[in-house]
């Protein structure tokens, strides 16, 4: 028969980041090959990465669509070398993947300190704001322009002599901290979605930025 | 098509407790935010608080916090303004609505209100 | 709390004729991340609920007449009606919808004249 050997596949994963998102299965193909179908709960199944033997599929430009929608993706099996055939009635083997919901779900990328400029005691950071591959009108929107105000920042400063930290916090890209004049700061930010009550509610710190290095600037 | 049905009008004394609902169809509810917004007789609109169906977070106006409980059944995609005692002050339209696809794009969709009348 | 002013509370204005509502918010609305104003302005009708008209500022929302029209950045921001008709009566709103809590302004009420 058309199916014979092969087998479904198992452990169907989402790995998504700013909405760059990859289905991933297992096992590593043998004699088989793969077609990945993703659908809305009220929509039709759409058929993607036809009869690859790659273990993973970039699902990025079907769920950017509508990233509020909650999607279903199923993993069919092929023998390897198969060509589709009309005749054929028996369903190939496959696996569901569990629900994704991309807005709750996507993962945050690890956000980068852009500038920081030092005026007086006060020092100004600016996060650089991240694009997705989500869009509007033909625009990919920002991280921003996604989550708004459910995006929050937080920045983690201290003297590169001691090892305190203080945070703030931000709903904007940028923060306005007060320094001790004379002393130098390091700085490293985290993206966090405050609604969220899973793990995927912060990022991972930015890499640390120190004053005295090229991005930063000091006025009087 | 979207649409926010809120449950009818009400007419409570002072003292008694409350819940009006607003369930939502057309979209998928649990990623959306569900907006409060009182408006009394005669006057302008005020902001309560909000909730997001799939987490269950809320924001309240500090005006309101402590008075009102907002919550969720994303189960049966309702959401809900609850009072545990009322107050003649509480008389008022009470409208749902549901904040837009993009962030910070407004309230896109409103339900149709519910007429809150507390009188002894 | 972010206040938000409007001007004028009323106006009166003989339909195809323009008008003009300005807002004023007490902090600024301007998103540093992605530039946009985070400025939102509603149109209630007479015994309805409101009605999303612009948002960021100068967005208009799908299905909105291009009449209408929004500007301004930062703090001080206007809704031009290029010309005025008969269905365009009600009260208006703008709304800080940047940062909690979320505030409107007091609203203006266009009349037909």
């Known amino acids: 028969s058309g199916t014979t050997n092969t087998v479904a596949a198992y452990n169907l994963t989402w790995k998504s980041t700013n909405f760059k998102t990859i289905l991933e299965w297992e096992p590593k193909p043998i004699n088989q090959v793969y077609t990945v179908q993703i659908s809305t709960k009220s929509g039709d199944w759409k058929s993607k990465c036809f009869y690859t033997a790659d273990t993973e599929c970039d699902l990025t430009d079907e769920i950017v669509k509508d990233v509020k929608q909650t999607y279903l993706a199923r993993v069919f099996s092929y023998p390897a070398g198969h060509v589709e055939s009309t005749g054929s009635t028996e369903e190939p083997p496959y696996e569901n993947s569990p629900e994704f919901t991309p807005y709750l779900e996507t993962n945050l990328g690890q956000p980068t300190i852009q500038s920081f400029e030092q005026v007086g005691t006060k020092v100004n950071v600016t996060v650089q704001d991240e694009w997705t591959l989500v869009r509007r009108n033909d625009t990919f929107l920002s991280l921003r322009d996604v989550f708004g105000k459910d995006l929050i920042y937080t920045l983690y400063y201290w003297k590169s002599s001691s090892s305190g930290k203080k945070t703030a916090k931000t709903n904007t890209n940028e923060f306005l901290i007060d320094v001790d004049k004379g002393e130098n700061y390091c700085f490293s930010v985290q993206a966090v979605i405050p609604s969220r009550r899973t793990a995927n509610r912060k990022s991972t710190d930015s890499p640390v930025e120190c004053m005295g290095h090229e991005k930063g600037e000091s006025r009087e | 098509e979207v649409q926010l049905v809120q449950s009818g009008a009400e007419v409570k004394k002072p003292g008694e407790s409350l819940r009006i609902s607003c369930k939502g169809s057309?979209?998928?509810?649990?990623?959306?935010?569900i907006e409060w917004v009182r408006q009394m007789p005669g006057k302008g609109l005020e902001w309560m608080g909000d909730i997001l169906p799939g987490s269950g977070s809320t924001n309240y106006s500090p005006s309101f916090q402590g008075h009102v409980t907002i919550s969720a059944d994303k189960s049966i995609s309702t959401a809900y303004l609850q009072w545990s005692s009322l107050k003649a002050s509480d008389t008022a339209m009470y409208y749902c609505?549901?904040?837009?696809?993009?962030?910070?794009?407004?309230?896109?969709?409103w339900g149709q209100g519910t007429l809150v009348t507390v009188s002894s | 709390d972010i206040v938000m002013t409007q001007t004028p509370l009323s106006l009166s204005v003989t339909p195809g004729q323009p008008a003009s509502i300005s807002c004023k918010s007490s902090q600024s609305l301007l998103s540093s991340g992605n530039q946009k104003n985070y400025l939102t302005w509603y149109l209630q009708k007479p015994g309805q609920p409101p009605q999303l008209l612009i948002y960021w500022a100068s967005t208009r929302e799908s299905g909105v007449p291009d009449r209408f029209s929004g500007s301004g950045s930062g703090t001080d921001f206007t809704l031009k009606i290029s010309r005025v008709e008969a269905e365009d009566v009600g009260v208006y709103y703008c709304q800080n919808d940047y940062t909690y809590p979320l505030t409107f302004g007091q609203g203006t009420k266009l009349e037909i004249k």
């Open positions: 609505a549901r904040s837009g696809y993009y962030g910070n794009s407004g309230f896109a969709y």
């Open positions: 057309g979209y998928t509810f649990i990623t959306y935010w």
